[in-house]
């Protein structure tokens, strides 16, 4: 079998809402993946599991099941949304995200995604991790790749 390539493209959109009294930020983050099937037979994308971290804390998780199949030597672009909540120990971010004196309220989030594919009863998992900028101060639609957080700026693991 040839490889199945998973490429995390980036954040497509981020829709934000706030709970004023509980100083909570709700961010619905839609991400885009490219999955390429380099084989001469179809493969099933069985599930996508994703999580988002802020300051080493998981703030959102999502799982998509029975997503699609990808034909031989074909590629599919898949969008998936992770609902995230920034609250409680991180409620200090509420002030930053709602501060009207600044235009862009970028925060750095770590996107983690695992794609499970199956073919002929065989299962394969491919994972990706990427740091991304997301504006927590307004609803934003991004050009693909626009929200990328440069590797040189990534904190050491």
């Amino acid at each position: 079998p040839r490889s199945i390539d998973v490429k995390y493209i980036g954040v497509k959109s981020a829709y934000v809402s706030y709970d004023v009294q509980k100083r909570t930020i709700y961010l619905n983050i839609t991400n885009t993946l490219n999955i390429t099937n380099n084989n001469y037979y179809s493969v099933e994308v069985e599930n996508i599991t994703a999580q988002v971290q802020f300051a080493k804390t998981v703030i959102g998780k999502a799982r998509l099941n029975n997503i699609t199949h990808i034909g031989p030597l074909d590629m599919k672009q898949i969008d998936y949304t992770v609902p995230t909540v920034i609250a409680e120990e991180m409620s200090y971010m509420y002030d930053f995200c709602t501060l009207i004196s600044i235009k862009v309220h970028n925060i750095v989030l770590m996107m983690q995604v695992t794609v499970t594919t199956t073919y002929f009863g065989h299962s394969e998992q491919i994972s990706q991790e990427r740091y991304q900028y997301v504006d927590c101060g307004r609803n934003t639609t991004y050009q693909l790749g626009q929200s990328e957080y440069l590797n040189v700026l990534q904190p050491q693991q």
């Epitope: 706030y18 709970d19 004023v20 009294q21 509980k22 709700y26 409680e88 120990e89």
Partner: antibody, heavy 121, light 112 residues
Amino acid sequence: QVQLQQSGAELAKPGASVKLSCKASGYTFTSYWMHWVKQRPGQGLEWIGYVNPSSGYTKNNQKFKDKVTLTADKSSSTAYMQLSSLTYEDSAVYYCAREGGSISDWYFDVWGTGTTVTVSS
Amino acid sequence: DIVMTQAAPSVPVTPGESVSISCRSSKSLLHSNGNTYSYWFLQRPGQSPQLLIYRMSNLASGVPDRFSGSGSGTAFTLRISRVEAEDVGVYYCMQHLEYPYTFGGGTKLEIK
């Protein structure tokens, strides 16, 4: 129907600790934050803090940060407030209050019966 | 901390008449989302407080429509029309916008 049943009156000596309870019934305990409010005899109301029963996260009024410990037990749907190093100023009625509502529209919709704490030597 | 001030410690009223109880906040409770986070509670003698008004002007469930709330960002009024004997007690305003949440000192409604 939604109810908050608080523990009985406490008589304690200065320097001692007491643990008050607030048992919730008639709703999903983990869905709403539980707040605590103090009322000294013949005086007004003072917000102490809250516990989120779902996560255990608490936030206290700075005035009470060294005085009060808030906890919640999901299995018994009970919120607790421990008062430590009691002084005469801690003599008061303590209420638990559920914060009902929805996003950006929260309010103290249900109050407990109140627990009287008397500090006396 | 936001200070809530109820200037009148008590207000006397005759049953059947109307009465207004006022409260001021040291900071505006009007949020940019359009909501004003002021609240009114009644504590009857020997009882726990009960919610009357939330977000300045919204009547809480089960509260008679004789009660109404109004105001601006920093000045709030609770109005009771056709006062009844069961309305006696202490009325507290509260701000539910910023920690620590704070209450006014209370206004006692007394029947003449």
